[in-house]
């Protein structure tokens, strides 16, 4: 079943290559388990950046080696992507799945264009 997810259109990554934004989805109602997936679209290619599941009992938990961190509150997920470089500039799409209990719902945001500008190297100093 379809569900809407909302996310900002544009985000500028920090000089340290960190970008954060909120992904908000249609109310979870009695959803006890929610899966959030971050997808990166480059041309016609869609790749998974990271994914995490959270339950009504537990906080959002990405894998320890994930490039993403996040927190959840109700039907909002605050997502942070780390280690971005200029070549990481692209459209990042938030996908939310209300997994359990049934019925299953899925929602995709329109995407957040993340701009990453690599910092200029510091000039050598004598």
């Amino acid at each position: 079943k379809g569900m809407h997810a909302a996310q900002p259109a544009v985000v500028l990554a920090s000089s340290r290559g960190v970008a954060s934004f909120v992904c908000e989805y249609g109310s979870s109602g009695n959803a006890a388990e929610v899966r959030v997936t971050m997808l990166r679209q480059a041309g016609s290619q869609m790749t998974e950046v990271c994914a995490a599941t959270y339950t009504v009992e537990d906080e959002l938990a990405f894998l320890d080696d994930s490039t993403c961190t996040g927190t959840s509150s109700g039907n909002k997920v605050n997502l942070t992507i780390q280690g971005l470089r200029a070549m990481g500039t692209g459209l990042y799409i938030c996908k939310v799945e209300l997994m359990y209990p049934p019925p299953y719902y899925v929602g995709m945001g329109n995407g957040t264009q993340i701009y990453v500008i690599d910092p200029e190297p510091c000039p050598d100093s004598d």
Partner: antibody
Framework: QIQLVQSGPELKKPGETVKISCKAS????????VSWVKQAPGKGLRWMGW????????TYVDDFKGRFAFSLETSASTAFLQINNLKNEDTAIYFC?????????WGQGTTLTVSS | DVLMTQTPLSLPVSLGDHASISCKSS???????????LEWYLQKPGQSPKLLIY???KRFSGVPDRFSGSGSGTDFTLKISRVEAEDLGVYYC?????????FGGGTKLEIK
């Protein structure tokens, strides 16, 4: 602390209607579904279905379609089970239970006796 | 509907013994997200059921570690090490993966 408190025992005649309540406290009522479970005398547990406390949408097991109705009074954090046109075989203990990823909290049960 | 079959029906034990209850489902109860919503409940006489184990092997808060759950697919087991008097009652397995969700028929743990 989290509690589900059900209404007291009922003695009814065949053909009558009963409405059992389940009042929740200690958590946000609309976050968790409420299921209803039947236990006939000396028998096991049977899941009857559940109601989504956010949308109000009920789901019934086939055997409990027709005479059975789940409803809510969200402002009072209360779920209801109504059984119409009671039959002798409805004699049982009825439990409500909160469900997230499990039935982690249960009501104490309401004993319904149907007898002419 | 998924049929949950528990064995044995009755399990006489001595206090301090180990106990093992089997629960078999008529089909795989792995849900679409890869999780298995298999639970174990204990109902003591005159009381409502209490959650022991969820998602096959996760102990609910406050449940002693002498209770453990295991299994996958269609075969599941609840083990109790060192049975205590407060463990006596009827144990039910339950699957919440496929609607209609279903309980097993129950296993009565009693003193030998």
């Amino acid at each position: 602390q989290i509690q589900l408190v059900q209404s007291g025992p009922e003695l009814k005649k065949p053909g009558e209607t009963v409405k059992i309540s389940c009042k929740a406290s200690g958590y946000t009522f609309t976050t968790y579904g409420v299921s209803w479970v039947k236990q006939a005398p000396g028998k096991g547990l049977r899941w009857m279905g559940w109601i989504n406390t956010y949308s109000g949408m009920p789901t019934y097991v086939d055997d409990f379609k027709g005479r059975f109705a789940f409803s809510l009074e969200t402002s009072a954090s209360t779920a209801f089970l109504q059984i119409n046109n009671l039959k002798n075989e409805d004699t049982a203990i009825y439990f409500c239970a909160r469900r997230g990823i499990s039935f982690d909290y249960w009501g104490q049960g309401t004993t319904l006796t149907v007898s002419s | 509907d998924v049929l949950m079959t528990q064995t044995p029906l009755s399990l006489p034990v001595s206090l301090g013994d180990h106990a093992s209850i089997s629960c078999k489902s008529s089909q795989s109860i792995v849900y679409i997200n890869g999780n298995t919503y298999l639970e174990w409940y204990l109902q003591k006489p005159g009381q409502s059921p209490k959650l022991l184990i969820y998602k096959v092997s996760k102990r609910f808060s406050g449940v002693p570690d002498r209770f453990s759950g295991s299994g996958s697919g269609t075969d599941f087991t609840l083990k109790i090490s060192r049975v205590e008097a407060e463990d006596l009652g009827v144990y039910y397995c339950f699957q919440g993966s496929h609607v209609p969700w279903t309980f097993g028929g129950g296993t009565k743990l009693e003193i030998k």
